[in-house]
Interface confidence: low
Amino acid sequence: PRSIDVKYIGVKSAYVSYDVQKRTIYLNITNTLNITNNNYYSVEVENITAQVQFAKTVIGKARLNNITHIGPLDMKQIDYTVPTVIAEEMSYMYDFCTLISIKVHNIVLMMQVTVTTTYFGHSEQISQERYQYVDCGRNTTYQLGQSEYLNVLQPQQ
């Protein structure tokens, strides 16, 4: 069998909301993957599991099942959304993300994704990790790849 290539393209959009009382930020982050099947037979994309980390803490997880199949020598672009929550010991970020007199609201997030594919009863997992910049101060739609090159607030360690 030939390889199945998974390429993490980047953040497609990030939609933000806030809970004032809890000083909590909710970010729905939609990511884009390209999955290429280099084989002469179809493969099934069985599931995608993803998680997002901020300051070495997991702030969101998602799992998509029975997603699609990819034909021979074909490629499919797949979007998946991870709901994330920045709260509790990271509530100091609430000020940063919501204050108008702060000009730059980008934060750095670690995106981790694992794609499980199957063909002829055989299962294969491919994982990717990428640091991405996301604006936590407003709803943002990114051109693909754009979120890799923004100014960023480094999280407090």
Epitope: V20, R23, D95, L99, S101
Partner: antibody, heavy 123, light 112 residues
Framework: QVQLQQPGAELVKPGASVKLSCKAS????????MHWVRQRPGQGLEWIGN????????HYNHKFKDKATLIVDKSSSTAYLQLSSLTSEDSAVFYC????????????????WGQGTSVTVSS | DIVMTQATPSIPVTPGESVSISCRSS???????????LFWFLQRPGQSPQLLIY???NLASGVPDRFSGSGSGTAFTLRISRVEAEDVGVYYC?????????FGSGTKLEIK
């Protein structure tokens, strides 16, 4: 220690322009917004605008949009307020003041002020 | 623009007394993040303004704890307990929530 040095006075003729300086020392110039405030004789304080020295991003009070231009020179850690088409109405003391800015403006506004430059517009 | 109103132009006070200076805003200064973006400054005669209080109730560095700030989203009070002679000057409130930032007209504290 943090210091904002401003010249004491400027005498300008009506219709002319003036460029007021505010030299910063004792802190990283590019990490803090610089604000400018006007105080006419016997009057209160009016916010003119602010500038982020790291990239010259500015916000103006619309009242001063055609009168004031904010500039910075990073190499000398100096902020400038340029005032144009001066009239007697523009006679005032002009203060510069810094506040934390960029990523970290959590609201500690204008914690250090210059001594102010008194501008007199007279022929 | 947000209008800041200081309705009392001057307050005469005897040293050792307490005094409250009020300020109102035309719009709530309570931000979605829970902070209230109101500041108090003192301008002593012939001097530059000095920051006293930030975010409505936080004492600025080096300011005596005789000063305190309180309020709601639109009504604010600066309280000075045990007024001293050095407290004379004009007290200004300022909103820092929205551009353009705006000051109140000031309240002059005078010693009787």
């Amino acid at each position: 220690q943090v210091q904002l040095q401003q010249p004491g006075a400027e005498l300008v003729k009506p219709g002319a322009s003036v460029k007021l300086s505010c030299k910063a020392s004792g802190y990283t110039f590019t990490n803090h917004w610089m604000h400018w405030v006007r105080q006419r004789p016997g009057q209160g304080l009016e916010w003119i605008g602010n500038i982020d020295p790291s990239d010259s991003d500015t916000h103006y009070n619309h009242k001063f949009k055609d009168k004031a231009t904010l500039i910075v020179d990073k190499s000398s850690s100096t902020a400038y307020l340029q005032l144009s088409s001066l009239t007697s109405e523009d006679s005032a003391v002009f203060y510069c003041a810094r506040s934390r800015g960029g990523y970290y403006d959590y609201g500690e506004a204008m914690d250090y002020w210059g001594q102010g430059t008194s501008v007199t517009v007279s022929s | 623009d947000i209008v800041m109103t200081q309705a009392t132009p001057s307050i005469p006070v005897t040293p050792g007394e307490s005094v409250s200076i009020s300020c109102r805003s035309s719009k709530s200064l309570l931000h979605v993040n829970g902070n209230t973006y109101l500041f108090w400054f003192l301008q002593r005669p012939g001097q530059s303004p000095q920051l006293l209080i930030y975010r409505m109730s936080n004492l600025a560095s080096g300011v005596p704890d005789r000063f305190s700030g309180s309020g709601s989203g639109t009504a604010f009070t600066l309280r000075i307990s045990r007024v001293e002679a050095e407290d004379v000057g004009v007290y200004y409130c300022m909103q820092h929530l929205e551009y353009p930032f705006t000051f109140g007209s000031g309240t002059k504290l005078e010693i009787k």
